[in-house]
């Protein structure tokens, strides 16, 4: 058993049929010594008396809010949560496996630039009695500070018969050094509590590996005289690191119709303009990627050919 | 050329060669993102590699003030990786595929380090650690980690030279 926060404790249980469970001793936070009784949740049934209460925690029915009273007055609470371990593996029932970029990916994180600011998100099908707490650091043995905000519900989607909820959190490294080569990864730890179930999820990454620039901005077309070609120009996204002579991007320019199966024109460039062939009912799209490190491409920025 | 006395390097040549290094480092190990190497006890193997750190003057302001600190750091790293790529880790079993770009990568590291420091000038170089894994699978894992680390190192070096070529070239 360990303390998650004040008056909230996590009991780690090996979860299998007829498991013996864990013996837990609760102590009432009071100078009083006599006349103390214990109850669980809303029940008025007295579970025991005395300053301490010893219980055998085996299942969710044994978890919950234990309260010690004296003469009708509440002295203190202890909330017991369960953390299940099945076949040596901690349960991951609360969050959905996003399976990208690999199986058992519960947390996904992205950064728009090298400033040390990043966003992580996760998915669940649970809509109520759900809380998250996020901590982060650079490195684990001698951790350097990363400050994370509160996790918020950022999107709701319908997937078949189920509703899916996306939560996200923004974090910022306290003393970021955008130009340096990272040697210690960022660690992100999410505590998830659903009713009386506790789970924790972790992710470890370098900012450079989660970079995904915003799409290029201000796409403009200029038809070339006596030609099917148009010159398309764009600018670096506002959110990208500066100066651009140092933090350079490379671009992919593509002309394509509505369908992915249609024919296309495609060219890669380090410049902020390119010449392509425009077709009726097609769109010109441009996306960006770090020029020197193969992290994710941005989403496409598009303008119609006409 | 960057010499210990402090003259400027051939920024444009360094830019071209460092960008080539980036391409080669990724073609030597393109699927690196699909393998979480941090789960494999990283510390004792690649913590010894020289990293370009915050105080090394490789940021745009540091380069403007005095590029020599940064160039010396990059030179140290190039020599270090050049030795690693020529070591038993890469030459031993399992043999590299004949079409592996590691050979080109090795030559390009040497080429860039020579551009930075011509014959007859000597900057301090970092001692190469004795990483000699006994098992072929350990060697394979170590190669992945070294190439992964090299990708990050040459990305910073390429940014430095691109910025230098754009803003510091005479």
């Amino acid at each position: 058993i360990w303390e998650l926060k004040k008056d909230v404790y996590v009991v780690e249980l090996d979860w299998y049929p007829d498991a013996p469970g864990e013996m837990v001793v609760l102590t009432c936070d009071t100078p009083e010594e006599d006349g103390i009784t214990w109850t669980l949740d809303q029940s008025s049934e007295v579970l025991g008396s005395g300053k301490t209460l010893t219980i055998q925690v085996k299942e969710f029915g044994d978890a919950g809010q234990y309260t010690c009273h004296k003469g009708g007055e509440v002295l203190s609470h202890s909330l017991l949560l369960l953390h299940k371990k099945e076949d040596g593996i901690w349960s991951t029932d609360i969050l959905k496996d996003q399976k990208e970029p690999k199986n058992k990916t519960f947390l996904r994180c992205e950064a728009k630039n090298y400033s040390g600011r990043f966003t992580c998100w996760w998915l669940t099908t649970i809509s109520t009695d759900l809380t998250f707490s996020v901590k982060s650091s650079r490195g684990s043995s001698d951790p350097q500070g990363v400050t994370c905000g509160a996790a918020t519900l950022s999107a709701e989607r319908v997937r078949g018969d189920n509703k899916e909820y996306e939560y996200s959190v923004e974090c910022q490294e306290d003393s970021a050094c955008p130009a340096a080569e990272e040697s210690l990864p960022i660690e992100v730890m999410v505590d998830a509590v659903h009713k009386l179930k506790y789970e924790n999820y972790t992710s470890s990454f370098f900012i450079r590996d989660i970079i995904k620039p915003d799409p290029p901005k201000n796409l403009q077309l200029k038809p070339l005289k006596n030609s099917r070609q148009v010159e398309v120009s764009w600018e670096y996204p506002d959110t990208w690191s500066t100066p651009h002579s140092y933090f350079s991007l490379t671009f992919c320019v593509q002309v394509q119709g509505k369908s992915k199966r249609e024919k296309k024109d495609r060219v890669f460039t380090d410049k902020t303009s390119a010449t392509v062939i425009c077709r009726k009912n097609a769109s010109i799209s441009v996306r960006a990627q770090d020029r020197y490190y193969s992290s994710s491409w941005s989403e496409w920025a598009s303008v119609p050919c006409s | 050329r960057a010499v210990p006395g402090g003259s400027s390097p051939a920024w444009t040549q360094c830019q071209q060669l460092s960008q080539k290094l980036c391409t080669l480092a990724w073609s030597a190990h393109p699927l690196v993102g699909h393998m979480d190497l941090r789960e494999e006890g990283d510390e004792e193997t690649t913590n010894d590699v020289p990293h370009i750190q915050c105080g090394d003057g490789c940021d745009p302001q540091g380069l403007r003030d005095n590029s020599q600190f940064c160039l010396q750091r990059i030179h140290q790293g190039l020599i270090f990786y050049e030795k690693l790529l020529g070591s038993d880790i890469f030459t031993g079993e399992p043999s590299l595929l004949p079409d592996s770009p590691v050979g080109q990568l090795h030559a390009s590291l040497l080429g860039l380090s020579q551009l930075l420091q011509p014959e007859g000038h000597h900057w301090e170089t970092q001692q190469i650690p004795s990483l000699s894994p006994s098992q072929p699978w350990q060697r394979l894992l170590l190669r992945f980690k070294i190439l992964r680390s090299l990708q990050a190192f040459v990305a910073v070096a390429a940014r430095v030279f691109a910025h230098g070529a754009a803003t510091l070239s005479p």
């Epitope: 060219v267 890669f268 460039t269 380090d270 010449t275 | -």
Partner: antibody
């Protein structure tokens, strides 16, 4: 499978014109760009231009501008390349080539030998 | 127009050996570079597109690398059917241009 079959060899006199055909099969004709590339004996490859069979749009290499015309007949899935004012240095194998991507060549015809000789 | 230069013009290699072919562009072309193989009396065949992307059906011994102005086609272990002429082609801008070719012949 995607296939391009070209017309047979031609012998032409200097100053004449030649029209080479290229019949496509195995795909929807308008779904691919069509290019013409030539190769003089013992020499390298030279791009001449492209046509979009969907709308007849063309782009020619400056070297052939004014002397070449590329057309298509969607009813027969056939592309044509006409080269006028032939000179002896136009002697070459002429290839048609196609791709869904405009700028490189995925599928090639077998080639048509055009000899220009007096 | 962009001039593509291939070297060497002829490469003599023994079967089973590795062959490295070079292609240089007269200006930076990012990764807009494609490789073809041509055997005598046949049309060219696409091997690699956008510098390093492999084509299904092309043996894995063919690989491409490079960006900017310098590109390499590597054939890791030459088979008898690989003796041919190899061309690079840039698609950075029109007109599309080819290199002069490298003939890979049996040593």
């Amino acid at each position: 499978q995607v296939q391009l079959v070209q017309s047979g060899a031609e012998v032409k006199k200097p100053g004449a014109s030649v029209k080479v055909s290229c019949k496509a099969s195995g795909y929807t004709f308008t779904d691919y760009y069509l290019h013409w590339v030539r190769q003089a004996p013992g020499r390298g490859l030279e791009w001449m231009g492209w046509i979009d069979p969907e709308n007849g749009d063309t782009e020619y290499a400056p070297k052939f501008q004014g002397r070449v015309t590329m057309t298509t007949d969607t009813s027969t899935s056939t592309a044509y390349m006409e080269l006028r004012s032939l000179r002896s240095d136009d002697t070459a194998v002429y290839y048609c080539a196609a791709n869904k991507e405009l700028r490189y060549f995925d599928v090639w015809g077998q080639g048509t030998m055009v000899t220009v000789s007096s | 127009e962009i001039v593509m230069t291939q070297s060497p013009a002829t490469l003599s290699v023994s079967p089973g050996e590795r062959a490295t072919l070079s292609c240089r562009a007269s200006q930076s072309i990012s990764i807009n570079l494609h490789w073809y193989q041509q055997k005598p009396g046949q049309a060219p065949r696409l091997l690699i597109y956008f510098a390093s992307q492999s084509i299904s059906g092309i043996p894995a011994r063919f690989s491409g690398s490079g960006s900017g102005t310098e590109f390499t086609l590597t054939i890791s272990s030459l088979q008898s059917e690989d003796f041919a002429v190899y061309y690079c082609q840039q698609s950075n801008s029109f007109p599309l241009t080819f290199g002069g070719g490298t003939k890979v012949e049996i040593k």
